[in-house]
């Protein structure tokens, strides 16, 4: 889960060994501040918990991927 | 492909623990999910618990909590479920079930194992 | 938690004829961004664990005849075999992954009759 140390920078310390269907996954944003001890990407579930994931997993890539053409594909 | 593979049939006296195990191959244990899905005789299916990635943690069911342990020794990529306070109505066969990527539902079962509590 | 009820518990249906299950869940299983409803059929036979017959309500598990199908959307939700065989006989479950806990309906037992 991810920690906000000060807010509002929300760090990431432990990233998730489990691969999680995209379709459990809502949003993701990445997180970067040098703050951070490292670079990671927080997904949003569809139930609104919080995963930390580490974003050179390919599995990861590609839910990002995937979100990113959701977002972009209008809904009819 | 993701394999699993029980433990054998267990007869317990009521009161007794017991701790049944899942050997995961074809893929790492701590890549999937590991749940414990159990059936009573000409019953139906009841899901008792299993690891959440979204919680980061193993979550029971709240009818078994306090009296189930789900472990893992990733060493030998073998999960466990032990239930203690054995009584009659947990005679069953267990059921270790996984996917590849964690949906919330189980495309990959073991053969079940079969635990009989009697006096 | 979500209830999982299934109608009806058992059905004897003749060889080649259509045998239709239902499921409804206490709440939905629809989650209206992706508009994937988060239902699942398995097909348990004797003496076997359950196998998995169809998931996001209506996806075919690659394998599985096309004489299964699944439909519906929200909390309601219907398995069909349409043109039963002697190897469908078995206990169907419905089974939601929405919400933990994970809960499964009750099972539906198919004959032939």
């Known amino acids: 889960q991810p920690d906000a140390i000060n807010a509002p920078v929300t760090c990431c310390y432990n990233f998730t060994n489990r691969k999680i269907s995209v379709q459990r996954l809502a949003s993701y944003r990445r997180i970067t501040s040098s703050k951070c001890p490292k670079e990671a990407v927080i997904f949003k579930t569809i139930v609104a918990k919080e995963i930390c994931a580490d974003p050179k997993q390919k599995w990861v890539q590609d839910s990002m991927d995937h979100l990113d053409k959701q977002t972009q594909t209008p809904k009819t | 492909q993701v394999q699993l593979v029980q433990s054998g049939a267990e007869v317990k006296k009521p009161g007794a623990s017991v701790k049944v195990s899942c050997k995961v191959s074809?893929?790492?244990?701590?890549?999937?999910?590991m749940h414990w899905v159990r059936q009573a005789p000409g019953k139906g299916l009841e899901w008792m618990g299993g690891?959440?990635?979204?919680?980061?943690?193993?979550i029971y069911a709240q009818k078994f909590q306090g009296r189930v342990s789900m472990t893992e020794d990733t060493s030998t990529d073998t999960a466990y479920m032990e239930l203690s306070s054995l009584r009659s109505e947990d005679t069953a066969v267990y059921f270790c079930?996984?996917?590849?990527?964690?949906?919330?539902?189980?495309?990959?079962w073991g053969q079940g194992t079969l635990v009989t509590v009697s006096s | 938690d979500i209830v999982m009820t299934q109608s009806p518990d058992s059905l004897a249906v003749s060889l080649g004829e259509r045998a239709t299950i239902n499921c409804k869940s206490s709440?939905?299983?629809?989650?209206?961004?992706?508009?994937?409803?988060?239902l699942v059929w398995y097909q348990q036979r004797p003496g076997q664990p359950p196998k998995l017959l169809i998931y996001?309500?209506?996806t075919r598990e690659s394998g599985v005849p096309d004489r299964f199908s699944g439909s519906g959307s929200g909390t309601d939700f219907t398995l069909t075999i349409s043109s039963l065989q002697a190897e469908d006989v078995a206990v169907y479950y419905c089974?939601?992954?929405?919400?933990?806990?994970?809960?499964f309906g009750q099972g539906t037992k198919v004959e032939i009759k």
């Open positions: 079930a996984t996917n590849e990527f964690w949906s919330g539902y189980f495309d990959y």
């Open positions: 074809g893929y790492t244990l701590t890549e999937l999910s």
């Open positions: 690891f959440d990635p979204e919680d980061g943690e193993t």
């Open positions: 709440q939905s299983v629809l989650y209206s961004s992706n508009n994937k409803n988060y």
């Open positions: 996001w309500a209506s």
């Open positions: 089974q939601q992954y929405f919400y933990s806990p994970w809960t």
